[in-house]
Amino acid sequence: EDGGPACYGGFDLYFILDKSGSVLHHWNEIYYFVEQLAHKFISPQLRMSFIVFSTRGTTLMKLTEDREQIRQGLEELQKVLPGGDTYMHEGFERASEQIYYENRQGYRTASVIIALTDGELHEDLFFYSEREANRSRDLGAIVYCVGVKDFNETQLARIADSKDHVFPVNDGFQALQGIIHSILKKSCIEILAAEPSTICAGESFQVVVRGNGFRHARNVDRVLCSFKINDSVTLNEKPFSVEDTYLLCPAPILKEVGMKAALQVSMNDGLSFISSSVIITTTHCSDGS
């Protein structure tokens, strides 16, 4: 890892990568792009998956937070031999399948998809790709697209969440390195701190949640602060204000001293959550303190 910017967000990150015949001589650039980007997501709660597509979609590495498995997954990725058609929808389908299975029982982790392709998608293939990207969105995913060389930006804007979720790389594959910082900045949603981190038992408080990327939601009205109390009950609260680097939220009233509330954020009205290691604890406050 080369230091520099990093992301501390706890969510599920899916790389959906074009391995069709047209990238045959550029796979190394794609691999190094993914490898460098993957190393920037450093939360122990972040899980990652590598999916490739050509004439069909293949999950090279299922979701894992295990860094050794991720290292092995990157090795598998490096060995990929491109060839075949650009069936991008097959890649999205493999991601949706994982989002569905991994989150079906109760708590849903937020999902971020970064899809990379180099070509224009012809009629049916574009229709299928948009349909499957929508299905991933239905399951709570935020979708980003990286277009290299001969891509159609209008198409990618419809497959991604919006035009702002598309990263055009017009100067060919060697220019992929140049967008790592901007992708990291845009795709990273992280909770870094809460102020105050200790609140008085039985009293109402407002909490400032410090972090990044809170305005990356498709609709900021759907952002929620979530408090998981003593690892059991979860309370969701609508923030008073949503800025990119902080949220101002009402904290739940925690009646007893020593109660702990783990802080989470939802970007989609509670469909899924970004986790963190930020904890708010209660203490006894005497009158006048």
Epitope: T59, E90, S96, E97, Y101, R104
Partner: antibody, heavy 121, light 106 residues
Framework: QVQLQQSGPGLVKPSQTLSLTCAIS??????????WGWIRQSPGRGLEWLGR?????????DYAVSVKSRITINPDTSKNQFSLQLNSVTPEDTAVYYC???????????WGQGTLVTVSS | DIELTQPPSVSVAPGQTARISCSGD??????AHWYQQKPGQAPVLVIY???KRPSGIPERFSGSNSGNTATLTISGTQAEDEADYYC?????????FGGGTKLTVL
């Protein structure tokens, strides 16, 4: 709880059309998170998926390659049911046919009771 | 598409552990599901997404998936577990089933 109730004839003549219906109670055919499918089971071919429909602001379908040219699955929102039509049947199509709910579109978590359809003259 | 192969039959003594395999080329990159079917009844989902158990399915049912083999494990097998078991996976707009394994509880 959710239940699927199948109906349709048990005997169909060769070259005719097999038609079955699956009525849903406790869920909606146009629910956004699910698909609805048909599977058949025969001693010779085991379990075989035939196709699915699902609603995501409009209706979509996917069919198995083996029957793609002969199959139609349609929703009926007014009756909260969906149907299977399989054209130009042959004795090879003799099987127990099941309808099923497919949450997320990826697996079969609830099945109808099954209908034995025999193709014979 | 992926082809799933199961042993035709597996026998186990009551209280023992039964393991049913489902092999397919690189099946670990797919998700395996398992269905139980008793005579004259529709199949019932017992494991999905490799290792997850639907509500209402006893804890003795578990699943795993690595390499070229997915495995359904029934620990402390009971007489009522005697049934046919089918593995299944979803690949490229197609749902593939194994040929089924008859589990006999001796």
């Amino acid at each position: 709880q959710v239940q699927l109730q199948q109906s349709g004839p048990g005997l169909v003549k060769p070259s005719q059309t097999l038609s079955l219906t699956c009525a849903i109670s406790g869920d909606s055919v146009s629910t956004n998170g699910a698909a609805w499918g048909w599977i058949r089971q025969s001693p010779g071919r085991g379990l075989e998926w035939l196709g699915r429909i699902y609603y995501r602001s409009k209706w979509y379908n996917d069919y198995a390659v083996s029957v793609k040219s002969r199959i139609t699955i349609n929703p009926d929102t007014s009756k909260n049911q969906f149907s299977l039509q399989l054209n130009s049947v042959t004795p090879e199509d003799t099987a127990v046919y099941y309808c099923a709910r497919m949450p997320g579109g990826f697996l079969f978590d609830l099945w109808g009771q099954g209908t034995l359809v025999t193709v014979s003259s | 598409d992926i082809e799933l192969t199961q042993p035709p039959s597996v026998s186990v003594a009551p209280g023992q552990t039964a393991r049913i395999s489902c092999s397919g080329d690189n099946i670990r990159s797919y998700y395996a599901h398992w269905y139980q079917q008793k005579p004259g009844q529709a199949p019932v989902l017992v494991i999905y997404g490799d290792s997850k158990r639907p509500s209402g399915i006893p804890e003795r049912f578990s699943g795993s998936n690595s390499g070229n083999t997915a495995t359904l494990t029934i620990s402390g097998t009971q007489a009522e577990d005697e049934a046919d078991y089918y593995c299944s996976s979803y690949a490229s707009h197609d749902y593939v089933f194994g040929g089924g394994t008859k589990l006999t509880v001796l």
